[in-house]
């Protein structure tokens, strides 16, 4: 067992080293370990093949680090791991896109509060048991086609806290199992009108905080699941265009929030919800 | 690191408006929600309401007429008005940061007593 | 307004297992937080998103949400954790946050 961590049996082989320090991957991590903890400590590099010898690992957390940089090797061999937490290492800003691949039994992955600027493409390829993906409070701008496209049975996926500008037709393709998107505290000022196309089993969808002042209904009439919307705090604009939406938000069966109108200046802040047919009036 | 630091009075006499600032320090009141909670005692937290990008404000309904919650991007921080008090209102009122949906951080709490 | 169903108290010995549970119909389909509140001090979110750990927070924290309930679990409770505990969704009937009664852990 590594100096700085304690090794035990029960319930699962776990080499724990929180919160001491470490500027480095351990040397001499038990090959039996199941779990590996890591966080909290000063780690900046995880290096190709670091894990390669722990055949049997199925929980690493390697968050509240300062991971600047996770060679696309570091994760080689570890055919059984099912949670991977890097979340808190606000220094990564980007992973190679290979990074991931081979995780076929991954189920969670946490990439929340890396920094991260952009997905590289086929950075999620070949995920097929992921059900959570954190990726929060990132700066993410664009959500680039098909990036989600093997992920058929992620339930949860968190993109709020970026700075998200449009949702394209192509963003979610391939989410069939989709239970809650979260969307909300980005810049999104467009979604494309087959954007959650894929999402026929999508309960919650949260886009409050971001920068639409229109939404199209044909968005929405794929979301047969849909439960619990919310869209406040949008720049909602509520003349004849906000028809659709108005007429949609009648008939939706699930709860939504208020969808506070901004224009025109007469039904500032009335909700959309509650207004008659005719006040969405001129365009 | 996110901390809030609460300020104001412990003591406020019935009838009178409780008011309590929140200052907040690594992070821009720019950003998130920011509300306030308060937890009579013996009972339950209970949410008073939330500012947004400085001027969006929303307000449990159940206090929706006596609240006010305001903001000072130049100082960094929010405020609460409750006004019209009574003993009912005697609680620890705490400010938090709200993700939107979660309270990630949290003021140290404010105890406030209504009596004359 | 509502309230999210928590037990008044759950007693557990050093070294076992407590669970906190929170009701409501279909709370499963809603995301559940949770947060502690050691005496004196002010809350501190522990689990969000049903199932997610804060940083920080011992692994022996765990979370899960479905059908019915939200449950809060602590594996080989130790003293320290002696805290009230709340659970805490987004009520979409109010159109804001509520929270449950809370749970006050004794450790034994």
């Known amino acids: 067992c590594p100096g700085a961590c304690v090794c035990y049996n029960e319930p699962k082989v776990t080499t724990s080293c929180p919160q001491q320090g470490l500027q480095a991957v351990p040397v001499g991590i038990p090959a039996a370990s199941q779990r590996i903890f890591l966080h909290g400590n000063r780690i900046s590099h995880v290096p190709a093949a670091s894990f390669r010898a722990c055949r049997n690992l199925t929980i690493l957390w390697l968050h509240s680090n300062v991971l600047a940089r996770i060679d696309a090797a570091a994760f080689t061999g570890l055919a059984l791991l099912e949670q991977l937490d890097l979340s808190d290492n606000a220094q990564l800003r980007s992973v190679d896109p290979a990074t991931f691949h081979g995780l076929g039994r991954l189920h969670t992955l946490h990439l929340d509060r890396c920094g991260l600027q952009e997905l590289g493409p086929g950075l999620f390829r070949g995920l097929a048991a992921l059900q959570y993906l954190y990726l929060q409070d990132n700066a993410l701008q664009a959500l680039p086609d098909d990036t989600f496209r093997d992920l058929g049975n992620l339930t949860h996926l968190f993109l709020h806290g970026n700075r998200i500008s449009s949702v394209p037709e192509r963003a979610f393709r391939g989410l069939h199992s989709l239970d809650r998107l979260l969307l909300h505290q980005n810049r999104v000022a467009h979604v494309h009108p087959h954007a959650f196309r894929d999402l026929g089993r999508l309960m919650t969808l949260y886009l409050f905080a971001n920068n639409l002042s229109a939404l199209p209904t044909e968005a929405l009439a794929p979301l047969r699941a849909l439960q619990y919307l919310r869209l406040n705090d949008n720049p909602w604009v509520c003349d004849c265009r906000a028809r659709p939406l108005w007429a949609w938000l009648q008939k939706f069966r699930g709860s939504s929030s208020e969808v506070p109108c901004s224009l025109p200046q007469r039904l500032a802040g009335r909700d959309l919800k509650r207004l008659a047919a005719n006040d969405l009036q001129g365009c | 690191q996110v901390q809030l630091q609460q300020s104001g009075p412990g003591l406020v006499k019935p009838s009178e408006t409780l008011s309590l600032t929140c200052t907040v320090s690594?992070?821009?009141?720019?950003?998130?929600?920011w509300s306030w909670v308060r937890q009579p005692p013996g009972k339950t937290l209970e949410w008073i309401g939330y500012?947004?990008?400085?001027?969006?404000?929303k307000y449990n309904p159940s206090l929706k007429s006596r609240v006010t919650i305001s903001a000072d991007t130049s100082k960094n921080q929010f405020s609460l008005k409750l006004s019209s008090v009574t003993a009912a209102d005697t609680a620890v009122y705490y400010c938090?940061?709200?993700?939107?949906?979660?309270?990630?951080?949290w003021g140290q709490g404010t105890m406030v007593t209504v009596s004359s | 307004q509502s309230v999210l169903t928590q037990p008044p108290s759950v007693s557990v010995a050093a070294g076992q297992t407590a669970r906190i549970t929170c009701g409501e119909a279909?709370?499963?389909?809603?995301?559940v937080h949770w947060y502690q509140r050691r005496p004196g001090q002010a809350p501190l979110m522990v689990i969000y998103?049903?199932?997610a750990r804060r940083s920080g927070i011992p692994e022996r924290f765990s979370g899960s949400n479905s059908g019915d309930t939200a449950t809060l679990t602590i594996s080989r409770v130790e003293a320290g954790d002696e805290a009230d505990y709340y659970c805490?969704?987004?009520?979409?009937?109010?159109?804001?946050?509520?929270f449950g009664g809370g749970t006050k852990v004794t450790v034994l």
């Open positions: 279909n709370i499963g389909r809603r995301s």
């Open positions: 805490q969704a987004w009520d979409f009937s109010s159109d804001h946050p509520v």
């Open positions: 998103y049903d199932t």
């Open positions: 690594g992070d821009s009141i720019t950003s998130y929600y």
């Open positions: 500012i947004f990008d400085t001027r969006t404000t």
């Open positions: 938090a940061r709200d993700a939107g949906t979660i309270f990630d951080y």
